[in-house]
Interface confidence: low
Amino acid sequence: AWELTILHTNDVHSRLEQTSEDSSKCVNASRCMGGVARLFTKVQQIRRAEPNVLLLDAGDQYQGTIWFTVYKGAEVAHFMNALRYDAMALGNHEFDNGVEGLIEPLLKEAKFPILSANIKAKGPLASQISGLYLPYKVLPVGDEVVGIVGYTSKETPFLSNPGTNLVFEDEITALQPEVDKLKTLNVNKIIALGHSGFEMDKLIAQKVRGVDVVVGGHSNTFLYTGNPPSKEVPAGKYPFIVTSDDGRKVPVVQAYAFGKYLGYLKIEFDERGNVISSHGNPILLNSSIPEDPSIKADINKWRIKLDNYSTQELGKTIVYLDGSSQSCRFRECNMGNLICDAMINNNLRHTDEMFWNHVSMCILNGGGIRSPIDERNNGTITWENLAAVLPFGGTFDLVQLKGSTLKKAFEHSVHRYGQSTGEFLQVGGIHVVYDLSRKPGDRVVKLDVLCTKCRVPSYDPLKMDEVYKVILPNFLANGGDGFQMIKDELLRHDSGDQDINVVSTYISKMKVIYPAVEGRIKFSTGSH
């Protein structure tokens, strides 16, 4: 028998520095977790103790904090090189700055293979990107070889900016021939490493003949065997065992997100490459694990430049940006309109001639808007200003909901109106009329939504049975502020870009902004 230790991360999302327990900014260092310096300590400890170790990443290193905003992926290559990752799969967020924003800072600088078997380049890009990412890589580990085959969510064109010269194929269809190729090369230990979410990970384990282990990402799935060490609730045991169509027991793993845990899986193979046993658990990277001083010094060095960036002007406003709770928790506020407009703008993807865009709607809890911005400071807007408006370090995510769920959400928005509570919704691509004289649960008297399958966008009444795409904060997607119906009834959820980054990019693009209160939210009394 031959034993392999797989160490794995996924959906790190720019958390290079240690974070608080909820993966936001570290405040009390004695309570903080994760970060590359602490990760390196644990990885080195395991490398010294065990003979055959692979360190793998299942994608979405890009996007999530000011680190990515400033360094644009250079930080990912630099620190992953320093930690000596063995391989990485491309995630959807690796395309957030377009293909160039992937090639230059990461693909050209990484000293480890970057993989995806289901992304095919065409046209002029084919030669430019050739060899910079691979469908698979055979890695020598001790006296053996291990094949790693990559995959990426085929939804990436709707979630990021890969452009028109990359084709995202069905994962299973694309993986099978690559695995078959590895078999003909006498590679009998094969790991599928990818970024398509836990459901697809399980399907790959079931359907792709020859895959021995699946290491996944995208769905931020936390698996654990025994009593979990922090706040995350396990979606199943670690590893999650799938019985393949040809009768093999295939371990599937994922390690939550944000670098909070290091996935740790021990696999025992027989001499023919069959998995005999698999066991392990994610390791919580808490403050009992010291931060490596050399990596920490380098983090401190790179950090200095971030402080300067946060005071630089992004753009100007010529109007007061009303982010006060007195406005945003009671009525349409222009800060809410600005943020929603930025959220839609960030999700412009012209992927189908029938649709002007794949999504037109935004909802945003008024309680998530924490500060106004005064235009009398020469109109200047900085990252620091935006961090006061959106201090929680969340993301703006894409969900699919039925019209009936949206209707419930808008009823919840005003079910206890007048108490300055955070659930009052700010909107984009939606016209809503409330009648507060009616009883809670029956106060939405008009709800019109902007069409997407149209060449001239216009507002049509919401259809209860239709499925709509909506951009909203991850806080709402997770049922925050009492929006349990969204969490319980959403049909799909893809995590998006860092909230401040979305708004800052929009302001930089527009240069001068002047959002108005324009009748997106109205109140009526009596018969409508």
Epitope: A74, D298, N300, K305
Partner: antibody
């Protein structure tokens, strides 16, 4: 070995612009900050600004912010510093320098160019 | 910005003597156990040369007679058993925040 080679001396008239180049070799150009510093005769060194070639991100000293542009060409591993609206007090030796790397000189300048004398005179 | 003040401005010594140069910062330049202070040597007509980084670390290739110490706002460069080739200007630089600044320099004559 690491080398930074700067362009030659320049004589400029007041109000003109000057663009100084700094060609790097012997290391991964995109992975380290390049800093620009100047030294007028008898004066202390003055930090002008810097650039991270991997992303093009720049930082400038407020004193020069309206007049200086720092750029980098990854294809030739060359950094540039352009100073506009020159005046006589800009007469100085301009240096480019590489900032230290992983686990070492946190922003210490470990390699320097030979310097470029810029003279501003009518 | 952080102002660095060196003393003395000038020092004349004979070979084998010990030289001490101090650099005082107008604000703390240390954090998380690291002191973002560095020392350089510059000879006439030449570019500066890094001697000490992070207050006390000797740059590779620099003779061990050079050493650095300090934390917070007060830092010292020491040259033991000074040699004639050490005649030069010496200056400190901080990298705690932007803009980075330099001391005015100390001229050491042998």
């Amino acid at each position: 070995q690491v080398q930074l080679v700067q362009s030659g001396a320049e004589v400029k008239k007041p109000g003109a612009s000057v663009k100084v180049s700094c060609k790097a070799s012997g290391y991964t150009f995109t992975s380290y900050w390049i800093t620009w510093v100047r030294q007028a005769r008898g004066q202390r060194l003055e930090w002008i600004g810097d650039i991270y070639p991997g992303s093009g991100n720049t930082n400038y000293n407020e004193k020069f912010k309206t007049r200086v542009t720092i750029t980098a060409d990854k294809s030739t591993s060359t950094a540039y510093m352009e100073l506009s609206s020159l005046r006589s007090e800009d007469t100085a030796v301009y240096y480019c320098a590489k900032e230290g790397g992983l686990t070492t000189e946190d922003y210490a300048l470990d390699y320097w160019g030979q310097g470029t004398l810029v003279t501003v005179s009518s | 910005e952080i102002v660095l003040t060196q003393s003395p401005d000038f020092q004349s010594v004979t070979p084998k003597e010990k030289v001490t140069i101090t650099c005082r910062a107008s604000k703390n330049v240390s954090t998380s156990g690291y002191s973002y202070m560095h020392w350089y040597q510059q000879k006439p007509g030449k570019a500066p040369k890094l001697l000490i980084y992070l207050a006390s670390n000797l740059e590779s290739g620099i003779p061990p007679r050079f050493s650095g110490s300090g934390y917070g706002t007060d830092f010292t460069l020491t040259i033991n058993n000074i040699e004639s080739e050490d005649a030069a200007y010496y200056f400190c630089q901080h990298s705690r925040e932007l803009p980075f600044t330099f001391g005015q320099g100390t001229k050491v004559e042998i």
